[in-house]
Amino acid sequence: KAMHVAQPAVVLASSRGIASFVCEYASPGKATEVRVTVLRQADSQVTEVCAATYMMGNELTFLDDSICTGTSSGNQVNLTIQGLRAMDTGLYICKVELMYPPPYYLGIGNGTQIYVIDPEPCPDSD
């Protein structure tokens, strides 16, 4: 069934290219296994940024080479995306799936617009 997912409308990445936001879902049941996916949407292109499946009460585990890290607390997932550059500015959508036990639920957030500004290079000092 459909599930509501809330996320902030806008986030500004830090000068080090790190952006964090909370993805909160209104769980209709008591899920024990949750899958969280971050999608980037630009025009008609949608790409998967990262994904993690976790057991409630445990840490999110992304792949070793993932640019994402995260923690969970109840129905909230705190997501951090690293290594962002200006060209990565875009709409980042939080997708939450309650995988187990049945019934399966899917929720898609409206997206967080992440703005990334490349830092100005430091001027050479004499």
């Epitope: 069934k1 459909a2 899958r35 996916t37 999608l39 949407q41 008609s44 292109q45 949608v46 790409t47 998967e48 959508i93 997708k95 799936e97 019934p103 399966y104 639920y105 899917l106 898609i108």
Partner: nanobody, 135 residues
Framework: EVQLVESGGGLVQPGGSLRLSCAAS????????IGWFRQAPGKEREGVSC????????YYADSVKSRFTISRDNAKNTVYLHMNSLKPEDTAVYYC????????????????????????????WGQGTQVTVSS
């Protein structure tokens, strides 16, 4: 710019057939799911059928199963809805809609046809084509 254009609607007698086309531009079907929806006067828009282009999986509303068939031609970037044994209750404006496959269940079939036939799942919509079944 994403565009969906439906065609093939018209007036047909009960028991007759029609083939609706949905021509997509601005994106390739490969990664998208295309759904057909219909809306009769005074009624809510309802899901009819859906095809997930990446793997060809299809979904149908119970009311059209065995009568309607959805197919795709990726080379033409077009999805078809073949409608047979039409009934007066099939009279409606038919719309096609598109959503990227990543915004649907990770594993095909999870949640049955629910997400594939739900209007709120879709991002892009065509203008619709009228189908009238009457003698």
């Amino acid at each position: 710019e994403v565009q969906l254009v439906e065609s093939g609607g018209g007036l047909v007698q009960p028991g007759g057939s029609l083939r609706l086309s949905c021509a997509a531009s601005g994106f390739t079907l490969d990664y998208y799911a295309i759904g057909w929806f219909r809306q009769a006067p005074g009624k809510e828009r309802e899901g009819v059928s859906c095809i997930v282009s990446s793997d060809g999986s299809t979904y149908y509303a119970d009311s059209v199963k065995s009568r309607f068939t959805i197919s795709r031609d990726n080379a033409k970037n077009t999805v078809y809805l073949h409608m047979n044994s039409l009934k007066p209750e099939d009279t409606a404006v038919y719309y096609c809609a598109a959503v990227h496959g990543l915004k649907l269940p990770t594993l095909r079939g999870l949640g049955g046809s629910y997400y594939y036939l739900q209007a709120r799942s879709y991002d892009y919509w065509g203008q619709g084509t009228q189908v009238t079944v009457s003698s």
